[in-house]
């Protein structure tokens, strides 16, 4: 099961994203909270940690794929694995990192000018051209988010603004990036006070147009910090 | 720190619903999946249903077309609808929140007690 391979002692001590993450050097995994970890002889308390399982890459992030913890292991028991960089080994696309592609078991860097027909030829022989399946998660398996695509129109599912077609920009949505208008003069904006607090926002508003920037609207200037309305302005 | 806080367990008869809501504050999105586990006496804790940023939710396999997980951000709070409950659908049900690799942070847990 799930569980009894997360407990055994051959993945008590792997590096990220096994054993730990950021901060987490080394942690074992966890089946339930404060339980105790058997390790040698006496059993220690360990860190509460638990990999997201899958049974797909669909499942995982975009840059993570979806495997089995030890190699040979139980072909049930899948969590998601950090992706391979260049050079590295991968038996399949989704097994790279984005920017990358499995080419004769390794993974390398997709160059468009070559990739996008070599990459079509490997979907086409893979999956047919049976689209009827298609979702909106299906990234894997299409020329979407790690293989390259048409530009995503508004609402299109993206990683980065590169993604989205022109006038767009890709901004979080609830559980998700989606490409959004960029801000037109005299619509609201977000100022981020400090570096990095727009990561906090939901609903994550692109940026300001061309020659637009966001300041405080005019006859805002009176009302207090946390009140004031900021717009996208000519500079 | 993250404080996970589940409400909506009970008691329900075979083949009914029930909508289990977790509830989080001092969240930041730089945890990107939550999830539900549940655990029944005696037994390990198991993954129930699980969902990632942009990503296609997980189900274990004794939940799948039975139980539903969604988030809405705006109020913080991740959802499991669980609908036509068995008897061995009875535990204590577990939000998560996740990291970058996995989960990190639990709530306290609410019981589930499916029983004529």
């Known amino acids: 099961t799930l569980n009894s391979v997360l407990n055994s002692n051959a993945i008590k001590n792997l590096p990220p994203p096994l054993g730990g993450a950021a901060g987490h050097p080394g942690s074992a995994v966890s089946a339930a909270p404060g339980i105790l970890y058997p390790g040698g002889n006496k059993y220690q308390t360990i860190d509460n940690y638990q990999p997201y399982p899958c049974a797909e890459d669909e499942e995982c992030g975009t840059d993570e794929y979806c495997a089995s913890p030890t190699r040979g292991g139980d072909a049930g028991v899948q969590i998601c694995l950090a992706c391979r960089k260049r050079r590295k080994r991968c038996m399949r696309h989704a097994m790279c990192c984005p920017g990358n592609y499995c080419k004769n078991g390794i993974c390398v860097s997709s160059d468009q000018n070559h990739f996008r027909g070599e990459i079509e030829e490997t979907i086409t022989e893979s999956f047919g051209n049976d689209h009827s399946t298609l979702d909106g998660y299906s990234r894997r398996t299409t020329l979407s988010s790690k293989m390259y695509h048409t530009k995503g129109q508004e609402g299109s599912v993206c990683l980065r603004s590169s993604d989205c077609a022109s006038g767009l920009c890709c901004a979080r949505h609830f559980w998700s990036k989606i490409c959004k208008p960029v801000l037109k003069e005299g619509q609201v904006c977000t100022k981020h006070r400090r570096k990095g607090s727009h990561g906090l926002e939901i609903f994550q508003r692109c940026y300001c147009g061309e020659g637009l920037s966001c300041r405080i609207q005019k006859d805002h200037h009176q009302a207090s910090n946390s009140s004031r309305l900021h717009t996208c302005q000519r500079h | 720190e993250v404080q996970l806080v589940e409400s909506g367990g009970g008691l329900v008869q075979p083949g009914g619903s029930l909508r289990l809501s977790c509830a989080a504050s001092?969240?930041?999105?730089?945890?990107?999946?939550m999830g539900w586990f549940r655990q029944a006496p005696g037994k390990e804790r198991e993954v129930v249903a699980s969902?990632?940023?942009?990503?296609?939710?997980y189900y274990a396999d004794s939940v799948k077309g039975r139980f539903t997980i969604s988030a809405d951000n705006s109020k913080n709070t991740a959802y499991l609808q669980m609908n036509s409950l068995k008897p061995e659908d009875t535990a204590v049900y577990y939000c998560?929140?996740?990291?970058?690799?996995?989960?990190?942070?639990w709530g306290q847990g609410t019981l589930v007690t499916v029983s004529s």
């Open positions: 998560a929140a996740g990291k970058r690799y996995g989960y990190y942070d």
């Open positions: 001092g969240f930041s999105l730089d945890y990107y999946g």
């Open positions: 969902i990632r940023w942009n990503a296609k939710p």
